[in-house]
Interface confidence: medium
């Protein structure tokens, strides 16, 4: 932002009324009036170019310093070319000197040269040659100097003529302020520019109404330079929740709009399934029956729990059941649907029922399922099972009602056979098993599966109608994994545990019952 100038003295604007002191009195500097652009203008002029040594002083009135620390002095003046006078005026000069003196009081007409300190010699960029003078072309020069730091109540300026033909048309003394500024939604007060050129005054800004420093952000600061320019902005303010930036201010969100945090973003329209918000809303309330999960952004539509899984089937396969379902017809407006499967078993004889989570095995954890199928195994025969599949989403926890579908299945399968090792040699294993007598009539055959431990690529199967089998052609001193499963008309029965049996080593041959 451009510096603001506070004028302390303006000769040109005073219309010749300032009455500056000349020394020596009545000689040298003289107040003159002229006409320029059909307007009367005043100037202090001196032109004693033919008179040898000159020491003519013009002193301003006492200027009250006020809050100024560094003053700027702008001079507009014209200087005649010494060669425009007959004989070149050997004592003629083309410069004059600028002085200042600080004081706490006005000395009036008591003028003392010794109190003045020289600021600079003022030389023109352009001198007025004869042809310009005759044609009344005033070659106006503009020079600026600055002085600081000032410490006393006021000051004088003085102009020393040493034999030039010069006219002072304007003397303007001012100091600079960094103007009041709104930047980054922060207000910076009008600040007096410092007096030392390299230094920058740090100024703290204040957030405008309804603006805040964002969490973790820097407080707004600017630097006021000597020339009254604001530099190096640091930090910023953001419109708080419920307000948005409109030009240099924060304006409340219109009804039907909201803003949930301090940010640079504008207010957003209330999302679907929300009630119309009042002015300055930070969020939009959900319609009845709709909810917002704690992690849901305020910009997301309100949602509700899903309906039940649309279609559920339970397909029994021996001691296993495959449960399949389709997603709910109404997702509640969310994509974070998960499913939970629970199991209940009932004994047909007694009609007693209870949870069966501990005794069955699921193909994947039954809670938080994202797929729409699961296999349940290790089911007990002659048992009725009821499976419940519940659909949940991010807002299900906010309501007490549940969305689920159930399917029942009866298990008419055998129990797993109980297996024993009857005998072994270096190349064979004799295995027997048993199942409860009531189930034996339903068994068609038994299937014995065996393989070397550690060899997952190949296995052998033997089927038999009896309750024992000898597995031949085995490798000596080798552990085999053996499982027995009953086969019924309905399919596979429950498999036995997998047993580890080892053949004998060649040096310890002979049958050994275990």
């Amino acid at each position: 932002a451009q510096g603001k100038e506070v004028v302390l003295l303006d000769f040109a604007a005073a219309g010749g009324e300032l009455g500056w002191l000349t020394h020596p009195y009545g000689k040298g500097w003289d107040l003159m009036q002229n006409i320029m652009n059909d307007m009367p203008i005043y100037m202090y002029s001196v032109c004693n170019v033919m008179s040898g040594d000159q020491d003519n002083w013009l002193r301003t009135n006492w200027v009250y310093r006020g809050e100024a620390e560094r003053i700027f002095i702008e001079l507009k003046f014209t200087v005649r070319d010494c060669n425009s006078f007959p004989g070149g005026a050997s004592s003629c000069k083309e410069t004059f000197n600028l002085y200042y003196a600080e004081s706490d009081l006005d000395y009036g007409t008591n003028f003392q040269k010794r109190l003045f300190t020289k600021i600079d010699t003022i030389a023109p960029d352009e001198i007025t040659v004869s042809s310009d003078f005759e044609a009344r072309h005033v070659k106006l020069n503009v020079e600026e100097r600055s002085v600081g730091p000032l410490t006393r109540k006021g000051f004088y300026l003085a102009f020393q003529d040493i034999g030039a033909c010069v006219a002072l048309l304007s003397v303007r003394v001012y100091y600079k302020k960094c103007p009041e500024l709104l930047q980054g939604l922060a207000h910076f007060p009008e600040t007096i520019a410092g007096s030392d050129a390299p230094s920058l005054a740090t100024v703290a800004g204040t957030c405008v109404d309804h603006a805040v420093v964002p969490p973790g952000g820097e407080e707004p600061r600017m630097h006021c330079a000597v020339d009254g320019e604001w530099l190096v902005p640091i930090g910023q303010c953001l419109c708080q929740a419920g307000y948005e930036k409109v030009e240099d201010a924060c304006q409340a969100c219109s009804p039907g709009f909201f803003k949930f945090e301090a940010s640079e973003s504008p207010c957003l329209e209330c999302p679907e399934h929300t009630l119309p918000s009042p002015e300055g809303a930070t969020s939009c309330e959900c319609e009845e029956g709709f909810f917002r999960a704690p992690q849901d952004p305020a910009s997301m539509p309100c949602t509700r729990p899903p309906s039940a899984p649309h279609y559920l089937t339970a397909v029994g396969m021996g001691a296993k059941v495959e449960l399949r379902w389709t997603p709910p017809q109404d997702s509640g407006g969310r994509e974070d649907i998960v499913y939970s499967v629970t199991c209940e078993q009932c004994w047909p004889e007694s009609g007693e029922c209870g949870p069966c989570e501990a005794s069955v095995r699921y193909s994947e954890p039954p809670h938080g399922l994202t797929r729409t199928s699961v296999t349940v195994s290790d089911l007990e025969p002659h048992m009725n099972y009821t499976f419940t599949v519940e659909a949940r989403n991010g807002v299900s926890g906010l309501v007490t009602s549940r969305s689920f579908r159930t399917a029942s299945v009866s298990i008419n399968q055998t129990e797993p056979p109980k297996v024993r090792l009857e005998g072994r040699s270096t190349t064979s294993l004799s295995v027997s098993w048993s199942i409860p007598p009531p189930q034996q009539s339903r068994v068609w055959k038994y299937e014995v599966t065996y393989r070397k431990k550690g060899d997952s690529n190949s296995y052998n199967v033997r089927r038999t109608e009896g309750f024992s089998v000898t597995l031949d052609d085995l490798a000596p001193d080798t552990t085999y994994l053996v499982q027995v499963q009953a086969l019924t008309q309905e399919g596979q029965g429950a498999g036995s545990k997998v047993h580890e049996f080892q053949t004998l080593s060649p040096e310890g041959s002979g049958n050994l019952a275990v």
Epitope: Q33, N34, C47, V79, S130, C165
Partner: antibody, heavy 128, light 107 residues
Framework: EVQLLESGGGLVQPGGSLRLSCAAS????????MAWVRQAPGKGLEWVSR????????HYADSVKGRFTISRDNSKNTLYLQMNSLRAEDTAVYYC?????????????????????WGQGTLVTVSS | DIQMTQSPSTLSASVGDRVTITCRAS??????LAWYQQKPGKAPKLLIY???NLHTGVPSRFSGSGSGTEFSLTISGLQPDDFATYYC?????????FGQGTKVEIK
């Protein structure tokens, strides 16, 4: 020494024309603003017209505007005043006058000029 | 146009007298004023310019003062050669008007 010598005056009938000349010597003519000033018999001085050092600008008194024309020839060091539509009230001694800013010890020229050097004058009589 | 009024119209004085002629402008002319001396049958001669500056070769008994609208020409010790008519002239505007003149005659 600066010398200005007017010529061309005489008796002329009302409505007639006359051309005055002013021969300059003893100074650099092309540096000077030149003017004509007249003085009716027994009366005071009246400024008539002026011309800048290089031929412009030119100014005229309201009483002669549109009838008189001032000009100069710097190569001949001569100033002219062409007077047309002459009237009885134009009867006067016409002086040629000059101003050189080099002799004017002021920083800014006055809005107009004064006259440092004068000729001896030439009489113009307008009468029937 | 700016009107220039001189007073008195005629002034009778003796050699050695101090005489003052005044000139009033109808509006402010700052210090843009010149004084001339004219003797019968002769061309005017410049005495003073810019109200108080003495023209080259003019005796120091002549002095001028004033600014704005009131001006004066003073001859501090009248000499026989000084009996003449004196004119003021403003050059604050292009009209460059003269006063009507003041005749200084021998008493």
């Amino acid at each position: 020494e600066v010398q200005l010598l007017e010529s061309g005056g005489g008796l002329v009938q009302p409505g007639g024309s006359l051309r005055l000349s002013c021969a300059a010597s003893g100074f650099t003519f092309s540096h000077y603003m030149m003017a004509w000033v007249r003085q009716a018999p027994g009366k005071g001085l009246e400024w008539v017209s002026r011309i800048g050092p290089s031929g412009g600008p030119t100014h005229y008194a309201d009483s002669v505007k549109g009838r008189f024309t001032i000009s100069r020839d710097n190569s001949k060091n001569t100033l002219y005043l062409q007077m047309n539509s002459l009237r009885a009230e134009d009867t006067a001694v016409y002086y040629c006058a000059g101003y050189d800013s080099g002799y004017d010890y002021v920083a800014v020229a006055g809005p107009a000029e004064y006259f440092q050097h004068w000729g001896q004058g030439t009489l113009v009589t307008v009468s029937s | 146009d700016i009107q220039m009024t001189q007073s008195p119209s005629t002034l009778s004085a003796s050699v050695g007298d101090r005489v003052t002629i005044t000139c009033r402008a109808s509006q402010s002319i700052s210090t843009w004023l010149a004084w001339y001396q004219q003797k019968p049958g002769k061309a005017p001669k410049l005495l003073i310019y810019k109200a108080s500056n003495l023209h080259t070769g003019v005796p120091s008994r002549f002095s001028g003062s004033g600014s704005g609208t009131e001006f004066s020409l003073t001859i501090s010790g009248l000499q026989p050669d000084d009996f003449a008519t004196y004119y003021c002239q403003q050059y604050n505007s292009y009209s460059r008007t003269f006063g009507q003149g003041t005749k200084v005659e021998i008493k």
